[in-house]
């Protein structure tokens, strides 16, 4: 039975030319995370984090996607075209597949600065200290 839930950074906005961290976290399950896939709104893959083999950044994003922190992804040099949905897919054993959604809005610099104070911080989890040991890797 799949008991886990995916927490994500939800709806986020970031400044054009800046960077943003996309984070998902799987909780409420003891399942082992074997792989996390990061996909863009058009279903193109950005990156893979395999528990055994490490990271693979897809070539189309190699110059502006950085792995981490933890199982998250840092998207750099943002353009307006980066606006849209992003998905994290957690492949786990024995549970199966969990999927989380993040919506990123890339704003023109002046707009981003103006709207920053209206953003609601995510409650609960502190993503700054995320690393693999927080993601239920039981060996």
């Amino acid at each position: 039975m799949m008991t886990g839930t995916i927490e994500t950074t939800g709806n986020i906005s970031a400044k054009k030319g800046g960077s943003v961290i996309l984070q998902c976290h799987l909780s409420s399950t003891m399942a082992q995370v074997t792989q996390v896939n990061w996909e863009q709104h058009d279903h193109s893959l950005l990156a893979i984090r395999n528990a055994e083999l490490g990271w693979h950044i897809y070539p189309a994003f190699k110059d502006r996607v950085a792995p981490g922190p933890g199982l998250g992804l840092t998207l750099q040099s943002l353009t307006m075209n980066d606006t849209g949905e992003y998905f994290c897919t957690y492949h786990t054993y024995p549970d199966g597949t969990y999927r989380g959604r993040i919506f990123l809005e890339v704003l023109e610099s002046s707009v981003a600065e103006h709207s920053a104070r209206f953003q609601i911080p995510i409650e609960g989890r502190d993503y700054k200290d995320d690393d693999d040991k927080h993601h239920h890797h039981h060996h």
């Epitope: 074997t34 792989q35 896939n37 193109s44 893959l45 893979i48 395999n50 055994e52 083999l53 490490g54 990271w55 693979h56 897809y58 070539p59 189309a60 190699k62 492949h91």
Partner: antibody, heavy 121, light 106 residues
Amino acid sequence: EVQLVESGGGLVKPGGSLRLSCAASGFTFSYAWMSWVRQAPGKGLEWVGRIKSKTNGGTTDYAAPVKGRFTISRDDSKDTLYLLMNSLKTEDTAVYYCTIDPLYDLLTGPWGQGTLVTVSS
Amino acid sequence: SYELTQPPSVSVSPGQTASITCSGDKLGDKYGCWYQQKPGQSPILVIYQDSKRPSGIPERFSGSNSGNTATLTISGTQAMDEADYYCQAWDSSTVVFGGGTKLTVL
């Protein structure tokens, strides 16, 4: 130690079929994207096609000259990659290698010795 | 269909630097890989993801990839480096090899 051993090659008539196998060991096969590459006698390397890991959909991609005639599959429980070749042509004559796609720093293993497929009447 | 172009042959003196180029449309948007093949042997991966070296490959092998050109550089070329070298454009939907370059160490 990463090892790939191809088998199943041989002499076949034009229009015939053949199934190649590649036995993998020394790594977690199910995580790897696997390709078939061929080399005609005295010629260069030519990519045939690939199959992604199940965790990336298990989908296949093929080079134009073999699309619709060749089928790549995998059996993760047996750590084995397959290449089913139908409607073979004389220009398919080559040594066929199975290879690990270089996705991960921790998985860039050597190629196998290859298996020779000869298509001739 | 996507094509990669390599020079058929490159010559270098022992101890000198050899550069082998590979050109293709927007090759820099893909990953460039390089394989070495000696007569009668299976190919060996010497560079992957543009500039990474697999374990066991000497430091004298390096790679770069930007724009429309990927380059394999062999510093302090040795006689044992004489071989055919193939570039490869790798992305998540397709793979293409160049025609190969014969490196001769004079």
